[in-house]
Amino acid sequence: SGVFQLQLQEFINERGVLASGRPCEPGCRTFFRVCLKHFQAVVSPGPCTFGTVSTPVLGTNSFAVRDDSSGGGRNPLQLPFNFTWPGTFSLIIEAWHAPGDDLRPEALPPDALISKIAIQGSLAVGQNWLLDEQTSTLTRLRYSYRVICSDNYYGDNCSRLCKKRNDHFGHYVCQPDGNLSCLPGWTGEYCQQPICLSGCHEQNGYCSKPAECLCRPGWQGRLCNECIPHNGCRHGTCSTPWQCTCDEGWGGLFCDQDLNYCTHHSPCKNGATCSNSGQRSYTCTCRPGYTGVDCELELSECDSNPCRNGGSCKDQEDGYHCLCPPGYYGLHCEHSTLSCADSPCFNGGSCRERNQGANYACECPPNFTGSNCEKKVDRCTSNPCANGGQCLNRGPSRMCRCRPGFTGTYCELHVSDCARNPCAHGGTCHDLENGLMCTCPAGFSGRRCEVRTSIDACASSPCFNRATCYTDLSTDTFVCNCPYGFVGSRCEFPVGLPPSFPW
């Protein structure tokens, strides 16, 4: 559908005569009839297949025709058509003289014709006017014409219908060729599909209007690219919806079981060493002089066992007091009333007289200490192990059991946590924020699954006389630490005590 537009510009009839040569009286009151039809090689009379149009009287004899389109007038002349423009046409323009006011063909005498022109040719749809001028013996007509598409019709032949819209059925305007041009934010064949927020996940997000990003179940975030973990998941993440993959140091279905309390809460105070001891639990190993679950309290003096040589400690308002056994005196029962004659040195210690025999000193063999060589050497008292390593007595020597992530004789070297497979007996290694954690198979425990829990050499209470039993972890054997006055591998033999004195 379109319109053939004809713009009459100027008609010249200087002598004011009809086609017959007869003059018009008083002048030629001129109007035009236009016939538009299909292309004919030789334009012949017959039906105006594409349409006809007539003008009112436009002037007398010679005149210019004013452009009257803006005022609702009839110049250019409109010849609408409701078919595909074929691209070719034939055009007949007749100039007539109107003696009266009735311009109908049947009301005019046949010799009222002033001039008739006929053209044919091809004409493409477009906005540009084609200017033409036709001259006969007595007249000249200047005009221009074009074909444009009706509203909502587009394309080379005005055959494409396209009506802009912005509703549920589409959001577009029309291009000159009739193709749809989507409004900003819309896409698809009919511009019905909104363009979601830039970056909105293709699968997990959608939108009902432009620049929106609505998440499908199980997804969240501005771009719907974050999965929603299992409801109640505390310290875990997900890679697909409803998962709960625990962060390091957390366990359980909802990752709410604290496997690394020490790191997460740092509960131990006053320089104490923290050890994780299972879910949501920990143990603080206090430095000397401190007590309490978190080593948050100072010890009362007696709790640090200040009395030597078997002295007993009594708490007092202003500190403590040592009650010394026979043969000893001093603030800590550190002085002896015995002499070398009383053979006071145990475990092969050699006695040296001091102060002209009023006192003595024992020179102890390796592995023994104390004023009477009565104590096995605890080579760990100097706390030689670095980085929280645990010191273990091994007969005449000592060794450090290092925390995960450390190695070396004194745990002074840092290792890359799980890289060296530190978990013994098939234990599984987990890298933690400040070390590692071993998950041990049944029958094993300890920080690195190094302890056989099924064997406890001390379980049978092999030590006598209230001696302290220690399990040697490397050999699954025991070591007895004897109290004062007893010797032997099980502390089963009493030492020959010196005779009692009358004082």
């Epitope: 679950v293 948050e296 100072e298 010890l299 009362s300 500190g319």
Partner: antibody, heavy 119, light 108 residues
């Protein structure tokens, strides 16, 4: 506002076990910093610290009472309990549960429950 | 154990006056871990001061604490009628935690 409420029998026979429970409301017993504490006050006398428990189960007792004490926690019920065995008339007192946070200053107390040891 | 001695056992003052309560420790209280409590008849103690001198939120500023080592003081700058009660000091630096025997503040 955190509240503590002691409960348990007001009369215990000598040599038997005193059992008290403290219910914590408007606060989680699982608070990392909290020391859930028992304190007693003998009639007309001063205050005596008995001991505490943390939600992890760690306990610390007054050495003078340690041999007779057992403090426990039930996180599912938001409660902690005191058991003292072999009681004598000297254990007759008002027993308070209290909360300490971070250090042992008691910012929240129960209203106290009086326990009389008598046959 | 650290023994705390409060003196005197009873103090008589009039409203509007300044009251000074003393607490002496048998050994030095490290980090000034000393607290003061107020107890009224039939009620539980109420924490007033911690760290020897830090006032608990909501406690009127007429209450102040001072001291270090073994000698500590609670001062009530201008006594109000509701201040007449029992006052206890408490040390929490050493186990076992201990309280003073209390000072009774009564109206003269």
């Amino acid at each position: 506002q955190v509240q503590l409420q002691e409960s348990g029998p007001g009369l215990v026979k000598p040599s038997q076990t005193l059992s008290l429970t403290c219910t914590v409301s408007d606060d989680s017993i699982n608070n990392v910093e909290s020391y859930w504490t028992w304190i007693r006050q003998h009639p007309g006398k001063g205050l005596e610290w008995i001991g505490y428990i943390k939600y992890t189960g760690g306990i610390h007792y007054n050495p003078s009472l340690k041999s007779r004490l057992a403090i426990s926690v039930d996180t599912s019920k938001n409660q902690f309990s005191l058991k003292m065995n072999s009681v004598t008339a000297a254990d007759t007192a008002k027993y308070y549960c209290a909360r300490a946070r971070g250090s042992h200053t008691f910012d929240v107390w129960g209203q106290g429950t009086t326990v009389t040891v008598s046959s | 154990a650290i023994r705390l001695t409060q003196s005197p056992g009873t103090l008589s003052w009039s409203p509007g006056e300044r009251a000074t309560l003393s607490c002496r420790a048998s050994q030095s209280v490290s980090s000034n871990y000393l607290a003061w409590y107020q107890q009224k008849p039939g009620q539980a103690p109420r924490l007033l001061i911690y760290g020897a001198s830090s006032r608990v939120a909501g406690i009127p500023d007429r209450f102040s604490g001072s001291g270090s080592g073994t000698d500590f003081t609670l001062t009530i700058s201008r006594l109000e009628p509701e201040d007449f009660a029992l006052y206890y000091c408490q040390q929490y630096s050493r186990s076992p935690i201990t309280f003073g025997q209390g000072t009774k503040l009564e109206i003269k």
